[in-house]
């Protein structure tokens, strides 16, 4: 019995639960998911019983080995998987536990302008980045377009100050989770500030 193995998969994708055994005479292998039986295998007779019929098409054993491949992953496949290898040559079963986290591929991040002010020729804008998958182990960072991979700010919200006459610089937000990353459409501080100024002028008028 080894330490818990952490696995990551993406919705619609596949994950393989690695399993090896040196036991020559394996009587049965039982896989469970959150305490519910998933698959029972008897290698000697070559019988494989998948408890729930809907899972039959999702279960496979790469190269005819003991490792279990689960495909067409869904969010609710996340959880604890446990395998027991039973053999008359073992005093107690050999076991292994896995924790599977299934994540969605990230949608394109949306950038919202939280708050803006324009004082003494300096425009202050708060940009907030979000995706439909917020809170699911999603991290955000900001970078200047054309500046290589160097991110200059970690976090969903970026506060920028743009002074009139400064060179404009496109900014993009990157959202990342364990299975994907996604970039927002670039935003231009100068344009946002000019739009904000226009809006203020029209309000005064």
């Amino acid at each position: 019995s080894g330490p818990v193995k952490e696995l990551v998969g993406s919705v619609g994708g596949a994950v393989t639960f690695p399993l090896k055994s040196k036991v020559k005479q394996v009587d049965s292998i039982v896989w469970t998911f959150n305490t519910t039986p998933l698959v029972t295998i008897q290698p000697e007779g070559g019988t494989i019983i998948v408890t729930q019929n809907r899972n039959r098409e999702r279960v496979d054993f790469p190269d005819g080995g003991y490792s279990l491949k689960l495909s067409k992953l869904k969010k609710n496949d996340s959880g604890i998987y446990y395998v027991g290898i039973y053999s008359s040559s073992l005093q107690q079963p050999s076991t292994q536990e896995y924790v599977l986290h299934v994540y969605e591929h990230l949608s394109k991040p949306k950038v919202t302008i939280d708050r803006q002010s324009n004082k003494n020729g300096t425009c202050v804008i708060n940009l907030t980045c979000s995706t439909d998958q917020d809170g699911e182990n999603v991290t955000y960072s900001w970078k200047a377009v054309g500046q290589g991979d160097n991110q200059f700010h970690d976090g969903a919200t970026l506060s920028i100050a743009w002074r009139s006459g400064e060179k404009d610089q496109a900014l993009t937000c990157m959202a990342r989770n364990p299975v994907s990353n996604s970039f927002s459409t670039p935003v231009f501080p100068q344009k946002l500030c000019e739009d904000a100024a226009t809006d203020l002028t029209s309000l005064r008028g």
Epitope: K24, P43, E44, G45, G46, I48, G64, Y66
Partner: antibody, heavy 120, light 107 residues
Framework: QVQLQQPGAELVRPGASVKLSCKAS????????MNWVKQRPGQGLEWIGM????????RLNQKFKDKATLTVDKSSSTAYMQLSSPTSEDSAVYYC?????????????WGQGTSVTVSS | DIVMTQSQKSMSTSVGDRVSITCKAS??????VAWYQQKPGQSPKLLIY???YRYTGVPDRFTGSGSGTDFTFTISNVQAEDLAVYYC?????????FGAGTKLELK
């Protein structure tokens, strides 16, 4: 990659025993059962037996109990099958084939076969 | 010994067709059946094990089904390279036994 290498052909005199070899590579030889299968010209497949290289446990088709002896040499990852007192009935192609883990009696990798001709 | 009966000795088909080969076990083998493909001059190749599990790398046009004593092997959208002899084998108990084979030929 997994490979099972067998000599292409063996010519044997009637009554003179012959020892066929099967050299395994590309996997842990002592972890998988090794099978031997007979195929007479134009005929189907006939299972002779299987041996586990870790401890040489053998399971033999009773039909071949007086005909075939299965052995292994772990140091060279080679399985052997000796055919005793060959007759024309033993002229056939003999395959070695590795068992899968998940179904220990299904065979996923096969050698190219050794064609045995028994003739005086 | 368990007898595996493949009633069709040969079958004629055309490229693009769907063809099914049947195999009957003389006693219950649960799902302990494998299917092999053998082309002339070549060694057999494992396609299906445990009645319905496709071996790694085998195209998904090959499928297996059945349990107990009745088993079916199906090729959908037959390709020219599928012309071969197909054997069923019970891997439920020793001695392991094979069907006599079904030769797939072009019409």
């Amino acid at each position: 990659q997994v490979q099972l290498q067998q000599p292409g052909a063996e010519l044997v005199r009637p009554g003179a025993s012959v020892k066929l070899s099967c050299k395994a590579s590309g996997y842990s030889f002592t972890t998988y059962w090794m099978n031997w299968v007979k195929q007479r010209p134009g005929q189907g497949l006939e299972w002779i037996g299987m041996i586990h290289p870790s401890d040489s446990e053998t399971r033999l088709n009773q039909k071949f109990k007086d005909k075939a002896t299965l052995t292994v040499d772990k140091s060279s990852s080679t399985a052997y099958m000796q055919l005793s007192s060959p007759t024309s009935e033993d002229s056939a192609v003999y395959y070695c084939a590795r068992s899968t883990m998940i179904a220990t009696r299904a065979m996923d990798y096969w050698g190219q076969g050794t064609s045995v001709t028994v003739s005086s | 010994d368990i007898v595996m009966t493949q009633s069709q000795k040969s079958m004629s088909t055309s490229v693009g067709d769907r063809v099914s080969i049947t195999c009957k076990a003389s006693q219950d083998v649960i799902t302990g059946v494998a299917w092999y493909q053998q082309k002339p001059g070549q060694s057999p190749k494992l396609l299906i094990y445990s009645a319905s599990y496709r071996y790694t790398g085998v195209p998904d046009r090959f499928t297996g089904s059945g349990s107990g004593t009745d088993f079916t092997f199906t090729i959908s959208n037959v390709q020219a390279e599928d012309l071969a002899v197909y054997y069923c084998q019970q891997h439920y108990s020793t001695p392991l036994t094979f069907g006599a084979g079904t030769k797939l030929e072009l019409k």
